[in-house]
């Protein structure tokens, strides 16, 4: 058993049919010695008396808020949550496996630049009685500070019979050095509590591996005289690291016809302009990627040819 926060405790339960459970001793936080009784949740049934209560925790029915009283007065509370292990594996019931980039991916994180700021998000089908707490550091043995905000509900989607809820959190490395080579990964830890169930989820990554630039901005077309060609120009996104001479991007320019089946013409360039043939009803799209490290491409920025 360990303390998650004041008066909230997590019991680690290795569960299997007929498992004996975990013996837990609760102590009433009071100088009183006599006349103390214990109850669970809203029940008035007295579970025991004395300054300590020993319980055998076998299932969720044994978890909840234990309260010690004296003469009708509440002395203290202890909320017991369960962290369940089954077949040697800690439960992962609260969050949905996003399955990308691989199975058992519960947390996904992205950074728009090398400033040490990043966003993580996760999915759940649970709509009520749900809380999250996020901690992060760089490295684990001698951790360096990363500050995370509160997790917030960022999107709701309908998926078949189910509603799916997306939560996200923003974190900032306290002493980020954008130009430095990373040697220790960022660690992100999410505590999830649903009703009386505790679970924890972790992700470990280098900022360089989660970089996804914003799309190029100010995408413009300039027709070339007496030609079907146009000059496409764009700018680095505002959120990208500076100076651009050091934090450089490479770009992919695509001409796409109205029909998805039509052949796409693609040009790759390190410049912020390119000359392409603009077909009728086509659109021109540009996306960006770190020039020197193959992390994710940005989303496309698009303009119609006409």
């Amino acid at each position: 058993i360990w303390e998650l926060k004041k008066d909230v405790y997590v019991v680690e339960l290795d569960w299997y049919p007929d498992a004996p459970g975990e013996m837990v001793v609760l102590t009433c936080d009071t100088p009183e010695e006599d006349g103390i009784t214990w109850t669970l949740d809203q029940s008035s049934e007295v579970l025991g008396s004395g300054k300590t209560l020993t319980i055998q925790v076998k299932e969720f029915g044994d978890a909840g808020q234990y309260t010690c009283h004296k003469g009708g007065e509440v002395l203290s509370h202890s909320l017991l949550l369960l962290h369940k292990k089954e077949d040697g594996i800690w439960s992962t019931d609260i969050l949905k496996d996003q399955k990308e980039p691989k199975n058992k991916t519960f947390l996904r994180c992205e950074a728009k630049n090398y400033s040490g700021r990043f966003t993580c998000w996760w999915l759940t089908t649970i709509s009520t009685d749900l809380t999250f707490s996020v901690k992060s550091s760089r490295g684990s043995s001698d951790p360096q500070g990363v500050t995370c905000g509160a997790a917030t509900l960022s999107a709701e989607r309908v998926r078949g019979d189910n509603k799916e809820y997306e939560y996200s959190v923003e974190c900032q490395e306290d002493s980020a050095c954008p130009a430095a080579e990373e040697s220790l990964p960022i660690e992100v830890m999410v505590d999830a509590v649903h009703k009386l169930k505790y679970e924890n989820y972790t992700s470990s990554f280098f900022i360089r591996d989660i970089i996804k630039p914003d799309p190029p901005k100010n995408l413009q077309l300039k027709p070339l005289k007496n030609s079907r060609q146009v000059e496409v120009s764009w700018e680095y996104p505002d959120t990208w690291s500076t100076p651009h001479s050091y934090f450089s991007l490479t770009f992919c320019v695509q001409v796409q016809g109205k029909s998805k089946r039509e052949k796409k013409d693609r040009v790759f360039t390190d410049k912020t302009s390119a000359t392409v043939i603009c077909r009728k009803n086509a659109s021109i799209s540009v996306r960006a990627q770190d020039r020197y490290y193959s992390s994710s491409w940005s989303e496309w920025a698009s303009v119609p040819c006409s």
Partner: nanobody
Framework: EVQLVESGGGVVQAGESLRLSCAAS????????MGWFRQAPGTEREFVAS???????YYPDSVKGRFTISRDNAKNTVYLQMSSLKPDDTAVYYC????????????????WGQGTQVTVSS
């Protein structure tokens, strides 16, 4: 919302068997832990069996070895196979869905059916 409808109750002789079914509709059935409870007149609702979304099962000593819970996610149905029935098993049997497994506590379940009567005569 999850809607639960029990069926299969009836009157049987002591020592006989009965299979109860519970059909679920609404939200995705496979996301829920399922349980069966029973209530005889004038008594509290009593836990009978539960099955997790990963097919682990949990029983109280009173029915262990006699009752078997199972589920078919393709049919959105949970079953309770009851054998060697005793007069003490007479009760209204309720199907329940929740998200905490294992739990024998009725308030850990979020959705309930209307119940099906089982009567075991001696």
């Amino acid at each position: 919302e999850v809607q639960l409808v029990e069926s299969g109750g009836g009157v049987v002789q002591a020592g006989e068997s009965l299979r109860l079914s519970c059909a679920a509709s609404g939200r995705t059935f496979s996301n829920y832990e399922m349980g069966w409870f029973r209530q005889a007149p004038g008594t509290e609702r009593e836990f009978v069996a539960s099955i997790s979304r990963r097919y682990s099962t949990y029983y109280p000593d009173s029915v262990k070895g006699r009752f078997t819970i199972s589920r078919d996610n393709a049919k959105n149905t949970v079953y309770l196979q009851m054998s060697s029935l005793k007069p003490d098993d007479t009760a209204v049997y309720y199907c329940a869905a929740g998200q905490l497994f294992p739990s024998s506590r009725s308030r850990d379940y979020d959705y309930w059916g209307q119940g099906t009567q089982v009567t075991v005569s001696s």
